[in-house]
Amino acid sequence: GPVWRKHYITYRINNYTPDMNREDVDYAIRKAFQVWSNVTPLKFSKINTGMADILVVFARGAHGDFHAFDGKGGILAHAFGPGSGIGGDAHFDEDEFWTTHSGGTNLFLTAVHEIGHSLGLGHSSDPKAVMFPTYKYVDINTFRLSADDIRGIQSLYGDPKENQRLPNPDNSEPALCDPNLSFDAVTTVGNKIFFFKDRFFWLKVSERPKTSVNLISSLWPTLPSGIEAAYEIEARNQVFLFKDDKYWLISNLRPEPNYPKSIHSFGFPNFVKKIDAAVFNPRFYRTYFFVDNQYWRYDERRQMMDPGYPKLITKNFQGIGPKIDAVFYSKNKYYYFFQGSNQFEYDFLLQRITKTLKSNSWFGC
C-alpha cells in the first residue's frame, strides 16, 4: 500500500468539534501523532493555514467524499491512506460525542487509530492492537501501542534510529535548525524577512526571535513551490518572485493579475533560463540579478539593463561566488549572500565580507 515518501509530515485541524475545548482537541491530536512519531523516524508539525499533508475534519453525514457518516454509533471516523489531495486526511463523525475521557468516544484513541490509516496501516486482527477495527476504551494514561502496531508501522517507516537526514526530493518541511540547511530565495518584505525553501517559507519579523513556517500556497495559492529568487522594492510595496523563466509580481502582499511573465522582459539574453538570486539596492535604485557565475544590473527607474553586463560575481563581490543561492539587502549597507549552508554579510560600501554565518543564523539556532 502507499506510504509517505518523506519524514516530515504536516497536519492541519480544519475545524473543531463543539463537544470539547479547542485546546483539548489540539492536545488529543498532537498526542495521537506523537504515539506514531515515538516509534518511527516520522516528525509531525501542525500548520494553521494552507495545504497540509493530513487534514483533520469533523463532519456529519455526507461531507465531501463517497463515505458519508451514519449518525451516532456505527462508523466513528475514517482516514485515507498516504497521498496527495484527500490522501492522509482523517474525518471524524460529528454525530459522535467526542471526549477526553471514557465517556462518549475518546478522541485521542480514535485519532491514534485513524492516523495509523493516514500513515498507511490497514486493520489488525490482534484485539490488543490499536489498529483492531473496533473501538474499545483503554486508560489513555497507560495507553501503549501493541507489538503488532509497532511491527506494522516500522515495516513501513523503520524505527526512530533511522532518522538520519534525508535529501528533500519530496518537498517535506526542512528542519529549520539543521546545520546543512540552505535556502532557495530570501527577501525582505517590509520589516519581515521571507526565507523560501521548496514549498515552504519562514517568516522572520525583524528583531524578534520567533519564526513561523508556512506553505507558499497558503499565502499565495496561485504561486508555485520552489521559488528560486526574490527581491523587494519597498517604496513601491512590490515583491518580485522568480521560478524558471517566469516571474510573479506581488503588490501589497497580493499577487498581481496577468502574471507570471517571462524573465526576458527584463532584457536577459535567451540563454538565461532561470535566476539564482536577486536583490534591489534602494540607494542606487538598481536590482542585481545573479545567474550562474555572473550578474546583471537592472535600472528600475528606466526599466532597462545597465550597459556592460553581465560581469563575473567573483570579480566585483570580493569573496563571494562563483555562484550564490540567495541574497537580500538590509540595514542600508549590507547584502546577505547565501551559498549552501553558509551566509556572508557583505558591506557594499566597503566592498568586502564583514561576517560569515550559518544560513539559518536568523532563527536563533
Epitope: G1, P2, N14, M51, L55, V57, A59, H63, G64, D65, F66, H67, H78, A79, F80, G81, G83, S84, G85, I86, G87, D89, H117, G122, S217, P221
Partner: antibody, heavy 122, light 103 residues
Framework: EVQLLESGGGLVQPGGSLRLSCAAS????????MHWVRQAPGKGLEWVSG????????FYADSVKGRFTISRDNSKNTLYLQMNSLRAEDTAVYYC???????????????WGRGTLVTVSS | DIQMTQSPSSLSASVGDRVTITCRAN??????LNWYQQKPGKAPELLIY???SLQSGVPSRFSGSGSGTDFTLTISSLQPEDFATYYC?????FGQGTKLEIK
C-alpha cells in the same frame, strides 16, 4: 500506459437489460476503486456507480439504485455494469473511470475510457 | 445532500484572454474539488485535483483555487486548444459544465 476499454453498449428497448464491461490494462487493477460515469447526448457528466477494490463496498446514484449493479473480476482486470429495467433517460455514453485511490474512494478520476454508447429506445 | 453549482454555463473568449470559471458547493467540501476538461467526442481529462494541484502534464496556464464552498478554475492566457467544456466535480457530484467557445 493505462488503458480502459468499454464494451457492451448498443440499442435496447425500454425495460430491457444490458451488461457493460471495462477491460483495464497498464496498471495493477485490484487495489483501486473503479467507477462508471455517463453522459447523455448534449448533456453534462453524471456519476453512476463506484466499487471498492475487493468488490465492496458499492455505491450508486439515486437515479439507478435498484436497477444497476456494479461488479468486478480482479483476476480478469475487468469492471462490469449490469443494467436492468432500462429507461429512455438512461441513454448516454457510459465511461469507465479509475479512481486515484484504494481503501476509501477519493472520487478523483485520473484515467477514463473512451466510452460506450447505450441507446434505450423503442 | 451536497450540490455543486457551476457558472457561467457558457463563455465566449479570445485566444490570449484570461478566463475564470467558478464552482460553488452548498456546504463545505474542504479542498475536495477537481476540475476536468472535455473536448467534443472525447473522454474527460483531469486538470486540477484537490482544488489547486495541477495534474501531471497539464500546462501551467491552468490553475485552481478555493476551499470550503467557493472554487475557481483560471486559464491565464487562452490557447486555441483550450476551447472545450469544463466540469468541476466532488466525489459523485459534477457541476453542470461550462462551455468555453471562441469569440
Amino acid at each position: 500506459e493505462v488503458q480502459l476499454l468499454e464494451s457492451g453498449g448498443g440499442l435496447v428497448q425500454p425495460g430491457g437489460s444490458l451488461r457493460l464491461s471495462c477491460a483495464a490494462s497498464g496498471f495493477t487493477f485490484s487495489p483501486y476503486w473503479m467507477h462508471w460515469v455517463r453522459q447523455a447526448p448534449g448533456k453534462g457528466l453524471e456519476w453512476v456507480s463506484g466499487i471498492g477494490p475487493s468488490g465492496g463496498p458499492t455505491f450508486y446514484a439515486d437515479s439507478v439504485k435498484g436497477r444497476f449493479t456494479i461488479s468486478r473480476d480482479n483476476s480478469k482486470n475487468t469492471l462490469y455494469l449490469q443494467m436492468n429495467s432500462l429507461r429512455a433517460e438512461d441513454t448516454a455514453v457510459y465511461y469507465c473511470a479509475k479512481d486515484i485511490r484504494g481503501a476509501y474512494s477519493s472520487g478523483l478520476f485520473d484515467y477514463w475510457g473512451r466510452g460506450t454508447l447505450v441507446t434505450v429506445s423503442s | 445532500d451536497i450540490q455543486m453549482t457551476q457558472s457561467p454555463s457558457s463563455l465566449s473568449a479570445s485566444v490570449g484572454d484570461r478566463v475564470t470559471i467558478t464552482c460553488r458547493a452548498n456546504q463545505s467540501i474542504y479542498t475536495y474539488l477537481n476540475w476536468y476538461q472535455q473536448k467534443p467526442g472525447k473522454a474527460p481529462e483531469l486538470l486540477i485535483y484537490a482544488a489547486s494541484s495541477l495534474q501531471s502534464g497539464v500546462p501551467s496556464r491552468f490553475s485552481g483555487s478555493g476551499s470550503g464552498t467557493d472554487f475557481t478554475l483560471t486559464i491565464s492566457s487562452l490557447q486555441p486548444e483550450d476551447f472545450a467544456t469544463y466540469y468541476c466535480q466532488q466525489a459523485g457530484i459534477f457541476g453542470q459544465g461550462t462551455k468555453l467557445e471562441i469569440k
